[in-house]
Structure formats: structure tokens, C-alpha cells
């Protein structure tokens, strides 16, 4: 019997969408690069429930860890790597007296338990997000793929 | 692997400076803080300061303000840490430390130490 | 700066029985985000400190199980559950919320 296997080993599924943490560090840019070259995206977070998920994740490793926020482009106005601002429903979850910017803290980072800014160039873990195979036509979709783990090499 | 190499041990005069330096391998060097610690004879850890490799950024101890300076050089992924104006009580082991902030703040790569003599 | 306190300063450790070392700052190390900034670090005879401890009470990759930390706020404690002879040294508690970071003055762990 063939099994639905939504999103590739090593992978966690949560309300459709596929996540990787990483078990190894890279600063904020060279995180995006990592997602991208698995056909993924440094993670946006969409909902409540999306960042709980995340948060706990994150937490429960004891890691801190990119996200897909940063203040790059503008300094003061927080934008996701797909180009969406952040709602202020969302300004919640930075640490209480965070974002600081001290130091040019730039880029968004899961910390305990909220969001931090950190500087981009600290090599820290990251999380990628993509959207989960339905299961429903290609043959593929019903295979474990191969490992698709967008660490480097141990240095 | 991760390495941070040191530079060899130094006899000073009082009043001179030093400078020791810190070449780090097996990781992206602009990617973790380097933090200067140091030791005196039968004494215990002194944190000195650090500095972000990637900016030259700096946060040095109010004690050593004014005689500390940390350099970096990127493209031979080398830290340095120069004290001037040296005192018979700088006597130390100096060393260099990775600050890795995947972890929170931990040092979890520490050079062999630079044995530094002051003496007249 | 927050001054770091350690006790005992000398501890006389018997193979496969506990040791604890208590570690206290002069100020809260709890950050807003829920981590205590104290690190724990094992300086061997002879060689450069080695990290144990991170965020107050997790155990770094590669560092073996009976070593644990626990505590909150301003009081700490490292256990080791049994001691073995490689764990002599030098144990240093340090806070890392605020620069200068400090360390406590250290715990000499020797083997009775």
C-alpha cells in the first residue's frame, strides 16, 4: 500500500506546509539561500497558530533561530522575505523592549520566548517553510523522497 | 573542525604593548563574535571584550577601556587583541573565544591561550 | 557590573559519588525572553576552559549526561551525579546577559 508522505524526511508537517529546522548555523542572508535551494523560503509566518507552533519548536530546542523578518530595507518598518509587511497583530511576539535595533539589529530571530532582532551576519539556525504536497496526482508525492536537508557539510 | 589558533607567548617590558593575535579555521569567521578572555597565574577568568568580525564592532570592559584594542582581519579570518601601556599585573594567559549566539551567548571554542610576561 | 559568587571554592570530589557547586549573581539573570544568561565552564589542568553549560541548565553537545544545571533568577547549581577523574579542574560559572560579561571566582574540583 502506498503511504502520502506530504513533506520530505526530516521534515515536520504542520497545517499544510512543510518546515525544516536546521542543525546547523548561518547568518540571516546565507539562511534565505539555504531554504531557497530546497525550494523553500526562510520561514513567514501567516497566523497564531503558525508562530505558537514555531515558537514552541524553537524553544523546546533550546536554539536560536532566523526567521524570515527583517527591518533590511527600511529601517523601523519590519517586512517578510515574501515582501509582506508585518501586521500589528504580530508586533506581540518581539521580547518585551524589543526590536532594539542596538547595534543595527536588522534581522528577526525566534528567541525563547518571542522575537528578537539580532545583527544579520550571526551565524544562527534557521527555519524553511514550504507548502506541503497534496498527495493527490503524481506518483512522487506518494514516495519518501530523498533527504532534502539544507545544512552544509560539518565544517 | 573548529579551530582558533593563538600566537606565541610574549615577554614584555613594562609599559610596552602586545599584541596577540587569533586565526580561526573550520567555520565562517565573520559569522561569531571573538571574545577576549584573560588569566593571571593562579587566578581566575577576566572577560576583556569582544568583537563582531563582520563590522569590527567592539564592547570592551570598562577596566581595560582606553588600553584595549581589538582588530580583525577578515580575509585571513584573524582576530587581535592589543594592550598597551603594560603592567607587571597583566601578567596572563590571554585567550581568544567563539561566541556563539545560536546557543544564547556561550563560548564554545576557546583558542590555546597566549601566555603574555610583563617584567622590567 | 553583576558580580558573580561561587561556593565551594574547594571541593573535594570521591569517584562515583555527587558533587554540586552553587553559583549566585548580585542581580537577576533572566531575560524577558525566558533564558537565564549563566553558563557554565570546565578549565582541565593545564588547557583551555571548555563549555558545559548553556542558558543556565542545558547541556552542551558532546558534554556527557552527569553533568546537569538547574536554577533561575540569581541562584544556580551545577551537579555532577558522579564524578570520575577526568572531571578535576577548574569550574567557572559566568553570566552573559549584560557586558562585562563576568565569571565567578571558580571551584576547585579535586579528587579525594
Known amino acids: 500500500e502506498r503511504l502520502c508522505h506530504p513533506c520530505p524526511w526530516e521534515w515536520t508537517f504542520f497545517q499544510g506546509n512543510c518546515y525544516f529546522m536546521s542543525n546547523s548555523q548561518r547568518n540571516w542572508h546565507d539562511s534565505i539561500t539555504a531554504c531557497k535551494e530546497v525550494g523553500a523560503q526562510l520561514v513567514v509566518i501567516k497566523s497564531a497558530e503558525e508562530q505558537n507552533f514555531l515558537q514552541l519548536q524553537s524553544s523546546r530546542s533550546n536554539r536560536f533561530t532566523w526567521m524570515g523578518l527583517s527591518d533590511l530595507n527600511q529601517e523601523g518598518t519590519w517586512q517578510w522575505v515574501d515582501g509582506s509587511p508585518l501586521l500589528p497583530s504580530f508586533k506581540q511576539y518581539w521580547n518585551r523592549g524589543e526590536p532594539n535595533n542596538v547595534g543595527e539589529e536588522d534581522c528577526a530571530e525566534f528567541s525563547g520566548n518571542g522575537w528578537n532582532d539580532d545583527k544579520c551576519n550571526l551565524a544562527k539556525f534557521w527555519i524553511c517553510k514550504k507548502s506541503a504536497a497534496s498527495c493527490s496526482r503524481d506518483e512522487e508525492q506518494f514516495l519518501s523522497p530523498a533527504p532534502a536537508t539544507p545544512n552544509p557539510p560539518p565544517a | 573542525q573548529v579551530q582558533l589558533v593563538q600566537s606565541g607567548a610574549e615577554v614584555k617590558k613594562p609599559g610596552a604593548s602586545v599584541k596577540v593575535s587569533c586565526k580561526a579555521s573550520?567555520?565562517?569567521?565573520?559569522?561569531?563574535?571573538i571574545n577576549w578572555v584573560r588569566q593571571a597565574p593562579g587566578q581566575g577568568l577576566e572577560w576583556m571584550g569582544w568583537?563582531?568580525?563582520?563590522?569590527?564592532?567592539?564592547n570592551y570592559a570598562q577596566k581595560f577601556q582606553g588600553r584595549v584594542t581589538m582588530t580583525r582581519d577578515p580575509s585571513i579570518s584573524t582576530a587581535y587583541m592589543e594592550l598597551s601601556r603594560l603592567r607587571s599585573d597583566d601578567t596572563a594567559v590571554y585567550y581568544c573565544?567563539?561566541?556563539?549566539?545560536?546557543?544564547?551567548?556561550?563560548?564554545?571554542?576557546w583558542g590555546q591561550g597566549t601566555l603574555v610576561t610583563v617584567s622590567s | 557590573d553583576i558580580v558573580m559568587t561561587q561556593s565551594p571554592l574547594s571541593l573535594p570530589g570521591t569517584p562515583g559519588e555527587p558533587a554540586s557547586i552553587s553559583c549566585r549573581s548580585s542581580?537577576?539573570?533572566?531575560?524577558?525572553?525566558?533564558?537565564?544568561?549563566l553558563d557554565w565552564y570546565l578549565q582541565k589542568p593545564g588547557q583551555s576552559p571548555q563549555f558545559l553549560i548553556y542558558?543556565?541548565?542545558n547541556r552542551a553537545s558532546g558534554v556527557p549526561d552527569r553533568f546537569s544545571g538547574s536554577g533561575s533568577g540569581t541562584d544556580f547549581t551545577l551537579k555532577i551525579s558522579r564524578v570520575e577523574a577526568e572531571d578535576v579542574g577548574v569550574y567557572y560559572c559566568?553570566?552573559?546577559?549584560?557586558?562585562?560579561?563576568?565569571f565567578g571566582q571558580g571551584t576547585k574540583l579535586e579528587i579525594k
Open positions: 573565544a567563539r561566541e556563539n549566539s545560536g546557543y544564547g551567548k556561550l563560548f564554545d571554542y
Open positions: 573550520g567555520y565562517t569567521f565573520t559569522g561569531y563574535y
Open positions: 568583537i563582531n568580525p563582520n563590522s569590527g564592532d567592539t
Open positions: 542581580q537577576s539573570l533572566l531575560h524577558s525572553n525566558g533564558y537565564n544568561y
Open positions: 542558558l543556565g541548565s
Open positions: 559566568m553570566q552573559a546577559l549584560q557586558t562585562p560579561y563576568t
